[in-house]
Interface confidence: low
């Protein structure tokens, strides 16, 4: 499988574009919208019928260094009585995001874009198959 | 994460922080296939808080196509297949990083941009506000 490339050939290159060595691209990591905040409903991870916990992963050679991953607490879903109903499934919802990876090769440092799959939360679904009779 | 130890003979000029501007390889390293969420999973239909997926396309951005979830109902689907308004379908939102062409239309010059996407929906017990 081919690794996807970011550059698109259909773009007309304006005169104002900065010079970039072949096979590379210039990336400004000063983030646009850095200070925007997520305004999700309060405590949905514990109020959900498919509740989840958060784990923070930390890697100093990645930008951003901190990536938060969700993990479903149960296999089943929580019913109106607060009990787990295993006729339903809690499943993770995932989203791809980009990170910049710093690589050390001898004395030189290089940078690589990387796609990371983040588990954002969980949802309750009707199962497709029950293997147990 | 593990910091890869450098050769002790290297000049000690490395900054622990990332520089503001970096040159990166055009190839994106990933082990995850970039799939249309409609094809990779049918959770959006099977969920008790089902959602529709809307295509958001922007050629000045990478990835140029992002799918946005919109919850179908205010309530959640109960065991009978009806909408139960004692529960709420709410979107799960996530900040993701994308690349924005900067200056515009340049093929190989980008800036990181943080955008907020709704990834899916989940069914929650509502917060009841009692009016005094």
């Amino acid at each position: 499988r081919k690794i996807p490339k970011v550059g698109h050939t259909f773009f007309q290159k304006p005169e104002s574009c900065p010079p970039v060595p072949g096979g590379s691209m210039k990336l400004d990591i000063g983030i646009i919208n850095e200070n925007q905040r997520v305004s999700m409903s309060r405590n949905i991870e514990s109020r959900s019928t498919s509740p989840w916990n958060y784990t923070v992963t930390w890697d100093p050679n990645r930008y951003p260094s901190e990536v938060v991953q969700a993990q479903c607490r149960n296999l089943g879903c929580i019913n109106a009585q607060g009990k787990e109903d295993i006729s339903m499934n809690s499943v993770p919802i995932q989203q791809e995001t980009l990170v910049v990876r710093r690589k050390h090769q001898g004395c030189s440092v290089s940078f690589q874009l990387e796609k990371v799959l983040v588990t954002v939360g969980c949802t309750c679904v009707t199962p497709v198959i029950h293997h147990v009779q | 994460g593990i910091t890869i130890p450098r050769n002790p003979g290297c000049p000690n000029s490395e900054d622990k922080n990332f520089p503001r501007t970096v040159m990166v390889n055009l190839n994106i390293h990933n082990r995850n296939t970039n799939t249309n969420p409609k094809r990779s999973s049918d959770y959006y239909n099977r969920s008790t808080s089902p959602w529709n997926l809307h295509r958001n396309e922007d050629p000045e951005r990478y990835p140029s196509v992002i799918w946005e979830a919109k919850c179908r109902h205010l309530g959640c689907i109960n065991a009978d297949g009806n909408v139960d308004y004692h529960m709420n379908s709410v979107p799960i939102q996530q900040e993701i990083l994308v690349l924005r062409r900067e200056p515009p239309h340049c093929p190989n010059s980008f800036r990181l941009e943080k955008i907020l996407v709704s990834v899916g929906c989940t069914c929650v017990t509502p917060i009841v506000h009692h009016v005094a």
């Epitope: 916990n53 993990q71 479903c72 295993i86 499943v91 | 799939t35 094809r39």
Partner: nanobody
Framework: EVQLVESGGGLVQAGGSQSLSCVAS????????MGWYRQAPGKQRELVAL???????TYGDSVKGRFTISIDNAKNTVILQMNSLEAEDTAVYYC??????????????????WGQGTQVTVSS
């Protein structure tokens, strides 16, 4: 596809200990949750213990403090250590897992899978 194979069931004296093991095999990409449920004759299936790949645990009320669950992510194996067993712990124990896997070239980000079950009998 994904298979879950349980081992370690059998007959044990009340107050004794027993260990159950479950191995997941197949085209596994990641394991989100793995654990155990049990079903006693004439009763509903109930949660025993679950563990996430990150090590977060959930226990059923009746086994808290007596049973311990652990996971070996590298071997796709979950182990249930059962101590201070009681006659009420007699049941068929089912391994359950929520696994992301490849099948026919499609990545399924997570589906629930079940083992065939292993009988644990506690004699008083």
């Amino acid at each position: 596809e994904v298979q879950l194979v349980e081992s370690g069931g059998g007959l044990v004296q009340a107050g004794g200990s027993q260990s159950l093991s479950c191995v997941a095999s197949g085209t596994i990409v990641n394991i989100n949750v793995m654990g155990w449920y049990r079903q006693a004759p004439g009763k509903q299936r109930e949660l025993v213990a679950l563990i996430t790949s990150g090590g977060g645990t959930t226990y059923g009320d009746s086994v808290k403090g007596r049973f311990t669950i652990s996971i070996d992510n590298a071997k796709n194996t979950v182990i249930l250590q059962m101590n201070s067993l009681e006659a009420e712990d007699t049941a068929v124990y089912y391994c359950a897992a929520e696994i992301g896997y490849y099948s026919g070239g499609t990545y399924f980000s997570s589906e629930a899978h079940w083992g065939q079950g292993t009988q644990v009998t506690v004699s008083s």
